[in-house]
């Protein structure tokens, strides 16, 4: 239940558009079973690419790229009747406002690929 | 390349701990191929659960739960020699500071499951 039940939700129209944000992260050491434990052993394996941008917070984001078009079968062969596809997620990042060395940021949505999964394509035969 | 090459990175120790953030999101309508296109057709299908918290921004986050312990084979049967596992990602959210109806927030790390992938476990026999 909310700590402040009468407060406007940050997504409400009447909520202030500019807020103060403390950058000392809570839950800094979140115990994560890293997706990277899975990137090699998945039937839709992926590589991780570093996306760096000093004008963004966080400045480093890791992006997944599927290693194959198809999926790896039990014998280690790629089966092209299945597809390796990226699982994407929208995340929020802070983008520095363009005035010189300002402490002002703006929320920005980013679409990132987190890992890959193996899907059965819908097959259509063209007449 | 950075707009302001001489500016301290927001992750530097000497960067101010409190910054101003504009909540008018850039790239609000990011064109995303939703992971939800895949949640039913994956060999490691998942369901999406709504995680709502009015003290957080964004207040609604969707979490994936793998539908099976094993993975779905070409015939639609679950193969328990493989594992459906959640792909997790650390994301940043804004947590409202606990003073009544404040416009102050703090960055918080959250570990979210975005979707599932199918992995082959290494088998060990216990003596």
């Amino acid at each position: 239940s909310p700590q402040n039940p009468g407060c406007p939700n940050a997504e409400d129209k009447n909520f202030p558009r500019t807020v103060m944000v403390n950058l000392n992260i809570r839950n800094r050491n979140t115990n994560s079973k890293r997706a990277s434990d899975y990137y090699n052993r998945s039937s839709s394996p992926w590589n991780l690419h570093r996306n760096e941008d000093p004008e963004r917070y966080p400045s480093v984001i890791w992006e997944a790229k599927c290693r194959h078009l198809g999926c790896v079968d039990a014998d280690g062969n790629v089966d092209y009747h299945m597809n390796s596809v990226p699982i994407q997620q929208e995340i929020l990042v802070l983008r520095r406002e363009p005035r010189h060395c300002t402490n002002s940021f703006r929320l920005e949505k980013m679409l990132v690929s987190v890992g890959c999964t193996c899907v059965t394509p819908i097959v259509r035969h063209v007449a | 390349s950075p707009q302001n090459p001489g500016c301290p990175n927001a992750e530097d120790k000497n960067f101010p701990r409190t910054v101003m953030v504009n909540l008018n999101i850039r790239n609000r309508n990011t064109n995303s191929k939703r992971a939800s296109d895949y949640y039913n057709r994956s060999s490691s299908p998942w369901n999406l659960h709504r995680n709502e918290d009015p003290e957080r921004y964004p207040s609604v986050i969707w979490e994936a739960k793998c539908r099976h312990l094993g993975c779905v084979d070409a015939d639609g049967n679950v193969d328990y020699h493989m594992n459906s596992v959640p792909i997790q990602q650390e994301i940043l959210v804004l947590r409202r500071e606990p003073r009544h109806c404040t416009n102050s927030f703090r960055l918080e790390k959250m570990l979210v499951s975005v979707g599932c992938t199918c992995v082959t476990p290494i088998v060990r026999h216990v003596a």
């Epitope: 079973k33 052993r41 | 739960k65 312990l69 992995v119 476990p121 290494i122 060990r124 216990v126």
Partner: nanobody
Framework: EVQLVESGGGSVQAGDSLRLSCAAS????????FGWFRQTPGKEREFVAG????????EYANSVKGRFTISRDNAKNTVDLQMDSLKPEDTAVYYC?????????WGQGTQVTVSS
């Protein structure tokens, strides 16, 4: 290293009940799921039941659904399989399985014999 200790196997009559237990010790952290497979001579090991550690979600083979119940004790790292209304076709060696997502540990097995 991980150790698995299975107990509770034996011989019973059709319609009777039996309870299998499996305790994990050693470096059994980051458990994905815990459960049981079984094997009869000349056949492949088949999945019986499993319980996911994070949320206690359970899954059963169709052949045992409604008769077998899997449960866990998080604090003790144990999993139990309550087997009711046993049938002769449930006769097999039952193997405890501890799954850590990318590594899976198999116990040595315990014999269950159901006679008609």
């Amino acid at each position: 290293e991980v150790q698995l200790v299975e107990s509770g196997g034996g011989s019973v009559q059709a319609g009777d009940s039996l309870r299998l237990s499996c305790a994990a010790s050693g470096r059994a952290n980051s458990i994905n799921w815990f459960g049981w497979f079984r094997q009869t001579p000349g056949k492949e090991r088949e999945f019986v039941a499993g319980i996911r550690w994070s949320d206690a979600y359970t899954e059963y083979a169709n052949s045992v659904k409604g008769r077998f119940t899997i449960s866990r004790d998080n604090a003790k790292n144990t999993v139990d399989l309550q087997m009711d209304s046993l049938k002769p076709e449930d006769t097999a060696v039952y193997y405890c399985v501890l799954d850590l997502s990318t590594v899976r540990y198999w116990g040595q097995g315990t014999q269950v014999t159901v006679s008609s």
